[in-house]
């Protein structure tokens, strides 16, 4: 999906109002220095591409993020503010239901969410630069 035509201001507002709080809650008990940020992004559409990948694509050591509250809110905000995004999710949602897994917060998942926080902050910074 090409995130170029999204309403970035609206996505930023949703992130600041609610998604950020859920990410921070997920990370509670860990320090910001516990993990190194290894994933970056260069512009707003690129940041959203990376955020989508890290949030919804299961990895061998962290398969459960898509069911978290911050992930559900991320999916909702992308569906709302990115033209045509929802139709790309119809088959993806059905596939996700089939691979539902036991919810376990592993260290790898915490590391992945730490990367997500970094990507979202980068997204906000690139937005501020444009303004």
């Amino acid at each position: 999906y090409d995130f170029t035509n999204c309403d970035f201001q609206k996505i930023e507002a949703d992130y600041l109002r609610t998604i950020s709080k859920d990410l921070i809650t997920y990370m509670s008990g860990t320090k910001s220095t516990d993990f190194n940020n290894t994933v970056s992004c260069s512009n707003r559409p690129h940041c959203l591409t990376e955020i989508q990948s890290l949030t919804f694509n299961p990895t061998p050591r962290c398969a459960s993020l898509a069911k978290e509250m911050f992930a559900r809110k991320t999916k909702a905000t992308l569906a709302l503010w990115c033209p045509g995004y929802s139709e790309t999710q119809i088959n993806a949602t059905q596939a996700m239901k089939k691979r539902r897994k036991r919810k376990v917060t592993t260290n790898k998942c915490l590391e992945q969410v730490s990367q997500l926080l970094g990507l979202w902050r980068r997204f906000i910074r690139t937005l501020l630069k444009k303004q």
Partner: antibody, heavy 120, light 107 residues
């Protein structure tokens, strides 16, 4: 089963406000946005706007900006649509309709409609 | 704002005939079109979503096709209960919009 039950018909004077409610049951309320659509007598469907409880956000049709407010009460699974500064051409049937925000993404269940008549 | 134009405005057909309803978008909207049926005094009812996806409980005589700007709702053999108004709707981008409707009436 999924049900959306709307409040009863209203008669209002021009310049007044109306608040229509829509009580949802049979599904997880926060998994869906609530949209509002109106239909003037003998006319087509007009999308008014939506409120998304999961994100605590709304979006309105520009035609109604400044006159409409959509809210929800998640504790009672009820959505509200308030329209202010009513005019005679606001006479219409007002529908609520749910739409999945993390799946389905379509208005698959509708309320029965609330007739609002604006007349002096 | 994406404008949807439905044609024809009215379709006069007999039971058993095939009905073909058209919906054209003012700009490409991929497959983000849904079709609703509305009978007098009733709320709209979802028939087809995302251009061609069928809904459980909807008779299979209803089918949808199209992508981009041109979409079609087909009723293979009209039953007496199918005479109603049909609306297309886009959810590609906000504000969501509806076509003006096609009335399918008994000839």
């Amino acid at each position: 089963q999924v049900q959306l039950v709307q409040s009863g018909a209203e008669v209002k004077k021009p310049g007044a406000s109306v608040k229509v409610s829509c009580k949802a049951s049979g599904y997880i309320f926060t998994d869906y946005a609530m949209h509002w659509v109106r239909q003037a007598p003998g006319q087509g469907l007009e999308w008014m706007g939506t409120f998304i409880p999961l994100l605590d956000t709304s979006d309105y049709n520009q035609n109604f900006k400044g006159r409409v407010t959509m809210t929800t009460d998640t504790s009672t699974s009820t959505a509200y649509m308030e329209l202010r500064s009513l005019r005679s051409d606001d006479t219409a049937v007002y529908y609520c309709a749910r739409m999945g925000v993390t799946h389905s993404y379509v208005m698959d269940a509708w309320g029965q409609g609330t007739l609002v008549t604006v007349s002096s | 704002e994406i404008v949807l134009t439905q044609s024809p405005g009215t379709l006069s057909l007999s039971p058993g005939e095939r009905a073909t309803l058209s919906c054209r978008a003012s700009q490409p909207i991929s497959i983000s079109v849904h079709w609703y049926q509305q009978k007098p005094g009733q709320a709209p009812r979802l028939l087809i979503y995302f251009a061609s996806q069928s809904i459980s409980g909807i008779p299979d005589r209803f089918s949808g096709s199209g992508s981009g700007t041109d979409f079609t709702l087909t009723i293979s053999r009209l039953e007496p209960e199918d005479f109603a108004v049909y609306y297309c709707q886009q959810t590609f981008s906000l504000p969501y919009t509806f076509g003006q409707g096609t009335k399918v009436e008994i000839k």
